[in-house]
């Protein structure tokens, strides 16, 4: 084994422990919670990040509904089961044997059941709508400048291919970022829109997952873009299956 490297850290995930004991004595970084080795040249999957985050305070969110099939992450944090690739397993269960099905971003898409509940496949979230409200400014941002800055952010900070940023809408003070990525569009090595959205969400909250980088400093033509609320909607390739009781609640 080679001697310890000077810079054995994970730039894309601070919730890791890195050690020079990988193949060939190279630096290897393991996600806290799961111990799985992560690729530090890209984003870590949301499942592994949630697993690592379990000690963090609960962060429940409630969103307005952009379509009848949109899902909202109302359940807050849980300790997820991740597959060998670090993706969410289709069925998640808690310590009391209550189980439910999730989509590819880990959001519940069925009613809760018991251990007999079956989740045949991991349903892909192919459309994510990030709804932001920015703090008051002297005037509205220029739409095309805002569009360019947000596309640059997703391309450079989150390494998301530009083709997956479908649109940026702006009606002061609301900004909407649409991410779209079908199963057929996602090639090997492509960042998942769910992972990019999660990193963005944590950045906006001032809880950056990047190692050693400063927090997110969003500026449009030098003017700070400060977000005061974030709502995220998830749309799956197959609509969720909830009972009527929940839908009318």
């Amino acid at each position: 084994h080679t001697a310890a490297q000077d810079n054995c850290t994970c730039p894309t995930n601070k919730m890791t422990v890195c050690s020079p004991d990988g193949p060939g004595g190279r630096c290897q970084c393991r996600a806290l919670g799961s111990g799985m080795a992560v690729d530090c040249s890209t984003l870590t999957s949301k499942c592994l990040l949630l697993k690592a985050r379990m000690s963090a305070p609960k962060n429940a969110r409630t969103l307005v509904r952009p379509s009848e099939h949109a899902l909202v992450d109302n359940d807050g944090l849980y300790d997820p089961d991740c597959d060998p690739e670090g993706r969410f397993k289709a069925r998640q269960c808690n310590q009391t044997s209550v189980c439910w099905c999730v989509n590819s971003v880990g959001v519940r898409r069925t009613d809760k059941g018991d251990l007999s509940l079956r989740c045949d496949e991991l349903v892909r979230t192919h459309h994510i709508l990030i709804d932001l409200r920015h703090r008051p400014t002297a005037g509205a941002f220029n739409h095309s400048d805002l569009d360019a800055e947000l596309r640059r952010l997703f391309r450079e900070r989150y390494r998301l291919h530009p083709k997956f940023v479908a649109a940026v809408h702006y009606e002061q003070p609301t900004i909407q970022i649409e991410l779209r990525q079908n199963t057929s569009q996602k090639a090997a090595g492509d960042v998942d829109i769910g992972d990019a959205a999660y990193y963005f969400e944590r950045d906006i909250k001032g809880e950056s997952l990047f190692q050693g980088r400063g927090g997110l400093d969003l500026r449009v033509r030098g003017e700070p873009l400060q977000v005061e609320r974030t709502l995220i909607y998830y749309l799956d390739e197959i609509p969720p299956k909830f009972s009527m009781k929940r839908l009318t609640a």
Epitope: D21, G22, P84
Partner: antibody
Framework: QVQLVQSGAEVKKPGASVKVSCKAS????????INWVRQAPGQGLEWMGN????????NYNQKFKDRVTMTRDTSTSTVYMELSSLRSEDTAVYYC????????WGQGTLVTVS | EIVLTQSPATLSLSPGERATLSCRAS??????IHWYQQKPGQAPRLLIY???ESISGIPARFSGSGSGTDFTLTISSLEPEDFAVYYC?????????FGQGTKLEIK
Amino acid sequence: QVQLVQSGAEVKKPGASVKVSCKASGYTFTSYWINWVRQAPGQGLEWMGNIYPSDSYSNYNQKFKDRVTMTRDTSTSTVYMELSSLRSEDTAVYYCARGSSFDYWGQGTLVTVS
Amino acid sequence: EIVLTQSPATLSLSPGERATLSCRASQTIGTSIHWYQQKPGQAPRLLIYYASESISGIPARFSGSGSGTDFTLTISSLEPEDFAVYYCQQSNSWPFTFGQGTKLEIK
């Protein structure tokens, strides 16, 4: 050269605790995981948990979670494994081992619970 | 947790013969498998790490292969000192786990 030197054999009564030490030398102590592995007489190897000496981050095999504590002292490059509420089935040789591929091992510490 | 199953439990061969030891994981683990040799009264010794990477000081007759779920340790020509117990171990995720061991005995 890399060395892991463990403390001597222990004889304990059921219900007691034991604390085994593992002193590292010959490498940067804070850069590598230290694992604890035990082996009951005539049995296979069982991973108990590990600790990252740089920041003391540790995690344990669920089987031992309520009874084991791993700590470190960077000033002496020593890792400790304490196992409480001992029972007869904890009689085993306890090893410390370095890294994820356990490239260096301590000589082992026999703990007898009787 | 990831379960590792080694086979056979016991392998009886003569010096000079080729030994093939198997380790199967309950789920895919890439190449995060390591092989150890243990002799009575001694600590285990690392032979191969990350499925196929050799360790300095370990004789070239020891080699490893495999990825995903199926892994093999091969000893090309057995020497008298090779008769011992061999363990595989995974470091893909916590908890790390070991196989139950293969005892290589003289025929």
